[in-house]
């Protein structure tokens, strides 16, 4: 399955929007820094089967969408930028969704797929619990925004690797 050219443009736009969402200096939030243990191994090559990689990317973006579409995020972040961000993520999801559906039944290792989906889910659980613990403070959102930028960049790198393998 070939992701459309607009997909990588959308990725870049989403990253730019995340960068623009910054409301306070990260330096004022150093005490709130947290290691969310990004599941790096799920984004390494490790004989990554394409069908599985696309499903993992889809899960990553779906969880990002859900994280940023809560009433708490609307209160903490710029609504106009959020709305634009939703549009980009929605497009990403549509692109990946059609790819996942084309590759349906192609996953060779269901157990590896389960582990990957669960690893991404747990990563976002850690982020969700962190925000809850910090009572959705502006610093907590700044830490999370920076973390999602990092994870988004890593997702983009995986997509580039998939493209170069075609």
């Amino acid at each position: 399955c070939d992701l459309p050219q607009t997909h990588s443009l959308g990725n870049r736009r989403a990253l730019i929007l995340l960068a623009q969402m910054r409301r306070i200096s990260p330096f004022s939030c150093l005490k709130d820094r947290h290691d969310f243990e990004f599941p790096q191994e799920e984004f390494d090559d490790k004989q990554f089967q394409k069908a599985q990689a696309i499903s993992v990317l889809h899960e990553m973006i779906q969880q990002t969408f859900n994280l940023f579409s809560t009433k708490d995020s609307s209160a903490a972040l710029d609504e106009t930028l959020l709305d634009e961000f939703y549009i980009e993520l929605d497009q990403q999801l549509n692109d990946l969704e059609s790819c996942v559906m084309q590759e349906v039944g192609v996953i060779e290792s269901p157990l590896m797929y389960e582990d990957s989906i669960l690893a991404v889910r747990k990563y976002f659980q850690r982020i969700t619990l962190y925000l809850t613990e910090k009572k959705y403070s502006s610093c907590a959102w700044e830490v999370v925004r920076a973390e999602i930028m990092r994870s988004f960049s890593l997702s983009i790198n995986l997509q580039k690797r998939l493209k170069s393998k075609e």
């Epitope: 859900n66 579409s69 999801l93 969704e97 996942v100 349906v104 996953i107 669960l118 659980q125 809850t132």
Partner: antibody
Framework: QVQLVQSGAEVKKPGASVKVSCKAS????????MHWVRQAPGQGLEWMGE????????IYAQKFQGRVTMTRDTSTSTVYMELSSLRSEDTAVYYC????????????WGQGTLVTVSS | EIVLTQSPATLSLSPGERATLSCSAG???????LYWYQQKPGQAPRLLIY???NLASGIPARFSGSGSGTDFTLTISSLEPEDFAVYYC?????????FGQGTKLEIK
């Protein structure tokens, strides 16, 4: 508000199949995995599997692999759980429950569908 | 598969008393993925506590959760008449997700 409405009770003969539906409303249907959990009379809860309504991929508990099929219809925001080769031990209330994270994990359940398997 | 064993199977107490329900896991469960549900006859389960110790929305403060590793506890500080029900612990730390067999809290 989030609502999950399930289909009505069913009576089936051993060896037959049953298909239970769960219609979702009050949220973006394709954004959350939907799970199926069953409960035999007077017994505990048992997780059967889950489906991502966005693309239809499924993860099933090993115990039900080969007998359960979860599908979805995005046009009606409905997920389905079909169980085949029914036996008397499959008599249970079947629930759909929405996934999520933190306080949203299984925070929303359908009302349950009683499936009775009897000859 | 992570087996969750709840004890006691039945707990008979009076309103106003303190209830302590246990959930023991066959192998270690990360506290972030341990949940508690309440179920009343003829109803679907209701989320009480998420991630071991966090109260779900609308749940009264008399409910609390604690624990780590393989041992988890649900405590109800002072029982109200509406608290008499079946309680389940649940883990989604690894597939397949599992539930305990339940503890029935009944009026003495």
């Amino acid at each position: 508000q989030v609502q999950l409405v399930q289909s009505g009770a069913e009576v089936k003969k051993p060896g037959a199949s049953v298909k239970v539906s769960c219609k979702a409303s009050g949220y973006t249907f394709t954004n959350y995995w939907m799970h199926w959990v069953r409960q035999a009379p007077g017994q505990g809860l048992e997780w059967m599997g889950e489906i991502n309504p966005s693309h239809g991929r499924t993860i099933y508990a090993q115990k039900f692999q080969g007998r359960v099929t979860m599908t979805r219809d995005t046009s009606t925001s409905t997920v389905y759980m079909e169980l085949s080769s029914l036996r008397s031990e499959d008599t249970a209330v079947y629930y759909c429950a929405r996934g999520g994270l933190g306080p949203a994990w299984f925070a929303y359940w359908g009302q349950g569908t009683l499936v009775t398997v009897s000859s | 598969e992570i087996v969750l064993t709840q004890s006691p199977a039945t707990l008979s107490l009076s309103p106003g008393e303190r209830a302590t329900l246990s959930c023991s896991a066959g192998s270690s469960v990360d506290s972030s993925y341990l949940y508690w549900y309440q179920q009343k006859p003829g109803q679907a389960p209701r989320l009480l506590i998420y991630s071991t110790s966090n109260l779900a929305s609308g749940i009264p403060a008399r409910f609390s959760g604690s624990g780590s590793g393989t041992d988890f506890t649900l405590t109800i500080s002072s029982l109200e008449p509406e608290d008499f029900a079946v309680y389940y612990c649940h883990q989604w730390s690894s597939y397949p997700f599992t539930f305990g067999q339940g503890t029935k809290l009944e009026i003495k």
